[in-house]
C-alpha cells in the first residue's frame, strides 16, 4: 500500500520536518527557521508558536514540533493548549470583570482560579455540618443526628466473603 | 513596504519580441519566488510560471513554455518576462507577484502585486 | 491540471450584507486554497492564503473556509470599498490555477 501510494504521491516520502516543494519538483527541503511539520507529506511547514507577552516558552519548537507554551507567574492557562492566560486570584476569591473579589457568604474557593461554588448542603443527604465552611473551603458533612444515637455504631461491618470459583453475580 | 513596480503600458509590434520588467524594494528579493500572471481584457487570471531569484530555477505552465522566459537580475533587483513572436493572443495586463515566505504555510499564495503592465500587439 | 470553478460569474448585494462567494477545485488541494480581491482599476490584493488564514492589513469581515474541493469567502458586512472582483487559486500542485472570478456589485 505504502508503494502504491508513493507512486501517486512523490511528497508521502517527505518525513516530518520538512516539506515537499511544489515548485522544485516535489523535492523534500528542511522546514525553514521558525517552522515545522508534525507530519510526513506536508506541503508547507507551519510556522512555530511564540511565546510572547504575558506566555512563556514551556518547549522550544523543533522542525517536527511545535513551541509549547505556559502562563508567566500570576497567570494560568485556559483553553487548548494554553491558548490564553488568565490572571490568579487569592484563594478565597473569583475573578470578575473588575478584578478578583472575595467569594459572597456561603460560597468557597480553595484554588487560585476558577468561581466561587456554593458550600454543601449536608441536610441534602441527611447529615449534620461537622466544620464550617469559609470562603476558602467548602464545609466538613458529619454523620447524620440519627447516626449519633447511643448504641449506634459507626463501624461498617466486613462485606462476605466470597467461595473460590464463584464469580460476582 | 514590499513593492513591485511595472511600466504601465507596452506597444509592441507582431513577431517583435518584448521584455517586461519588474523592480522589487522592500524585501530580501533573492529569499522569494516572483510570479508572473496574464490578464486578459475581461477575462480571468493565468499563471505563466516562476522564478527563485537566488538561483534562477524556474516552472512554466506547459500552455506558456514556448512564449515565456523568465530571468532575473539580481544587482538590480529586478525580474524579467520576455514574450516571444508577439501576436494579438498576446495583448493582455501581465502582473508579477511576490511569493509567500519559503517553506511556510503562505508559500504557494501571491501575497503582494504589481499594478501589471498592459501589452498591447499591434501593427 | 486541477480546474477551479467560481460558479457565480457575479453577484448584487446591498451594503452590509453578508456575502459568500463559494469555489471549487476539481480534486482536493489540501487547504492550498488563497483569495483575492481585484479592484476596478486592476489593482489585485492577496486576502486570505490556505483556506482561512488572514493577509496582514486584510479587515476581518473577510474570512475564508472550507476543505477537499469546497471553498468559500464570506465578507460579513459588506462595504462600498468591498467591490470588486475576487478570484480564487489552488497552490496545491503546479501549474497553479484560478477560478474565473467573481464580480460583487452594489444592488
Known amino acids: 500500500f505504502e508503494r502504491t501510494r508513493s507512486l501517486q504521491d512523490p511528497c508521502s516520502n517527505c518525513p516530518a520536518g520538512t516539506f515537499c516543494d511544489n515548485n522544485r519538483n516535489q523535492i523534500c527541503s528542511p522546514c525553514p527557521p521558525n517552522s515545522f511539520s508534525s507530519a510526513g507529506g506536508q506541503r508547507t511547514c507551519d510556522i512555530c508558536r511564540q511565546c510572547k507577552g504575558v506566555f512563556r516558552t514551556r518547549k522550544e519548537c523543533s522542525s517536527t514540533s511545535n513551541a509549547e507554551c505556559d502562563c508567566t507567574p500570576g497567570f494560568h492557562c485556559l483553553g487548548a493548549g494554553c491558548s490564553m492566560c488568565e490572571q490568579d486570584c487569592k484563594q478565597g476569591q473569583e475573578l470578575t470583570k473588575k478584578g478578583c473579589k472575595d467569594c459572597c457568604f456561603g460560597t468557597f474557593n480553595d484554588q487560585k482560579r476558577g468561581i466561587c461554588r456554593p458550600w454543601t448542603n449536608c441536610s441534602l443527604d441527611g447529615k449534620s455540618v461537622l466544620v464550617n465552611g469559609t470562603k476558602e473551603r467548602d464545609v466538613v458533612c458529619g454523620p447524620s443526628p440519627a447516626d449519633l444515637s447511643p448504641g449506634a455504631s459507626s463501624v461498617t461491618p466486613p462485606a462476605p466473603a466470597r467461595e473460590p470459583g464463584h464469580s460476582p453475580q | 513596504q514590499v513593492q513591485l513596480q511595472q511600466p504601465g503600458a507596452e506597444l509592441v509590434r507582431p513577431g517583435a519580441s518584448v521584455k517586461l520588467s519588474c523592480k522589487a524594494s522592500g524585501y530580501t528579493f533573492t529569499s522569494y519566488w516572483i510570479n508572473w500572471v496574464k490578464q486578459r481584457p475581461g477575462q480571468g487570471l493565468e499563471w505563466i510560471g516562476n522564478i527563485y531569484p537566488s538561483d534562477s530555477y524556474t516552472n512554466y505552465d506547459q500552455k506558456f513554455k514556448d512564449k515565456a522566459t523568465l530571468t532575473v537580475d539580481k544587482s538590480s533587483s529586478t525580474a524579467y518576462m520576455q514574450l516571444s513572436s508577439p501576436t494579438s493572443e498576446d495583448s493582455a495586463v501581465y502582473y508579477c507577484t511576490k511569493s509567500g515566505e519559503y517553506g511556510k504555510i503562505g508559500y504557494y499564495a501571491m501575497d503582494y502585486w504589481g499594478q501589471g503592465t498592459s501589452v498591447t500587439v499591434s501593427s | 491540471d486541477i480546474q477551479m470553478t467560481q460558479t457565480t460569474s457575479s453577484l448584487s448585494a446591498s451594503l452590509g450584507d453578508r456575502v459568500t462567494i463559494s469555489c471549487r477545485a476539481s480534486q482536493d488541494i489540501s487547504n492550498y486554497l488563497n483569495w483575492y480581491q481585484q479592484k476596478p482599476d486592476g489593482t489585485v490584493k492577496l486576502l486570505i492564503y490556505y483556506t482561512s488564514r488572514l493577509h496582514s492589513g486584510v479587515p476581518s469581515r473577510f474570512s475564508g473556509s472550507g476543505s477537499g474541493t469546497d471553498y468559500s469567502l464570506t465578507i460579513s458586512n459588506l462595504e462600498q470599498e468591498d467591490i470588486a472582483t475576487y478570484f480564487c487559486?489552488?497552490?496545491?500542485?503546479?501549474?497553479?490555477?484560478f477560478g474565473g472570478g467573481t464580480k460583487l456589485e452594489i444592488k
Open positions: 487559486q489552488q497552490g496545491n500542485t503546479l501549474p497553479y490555477t
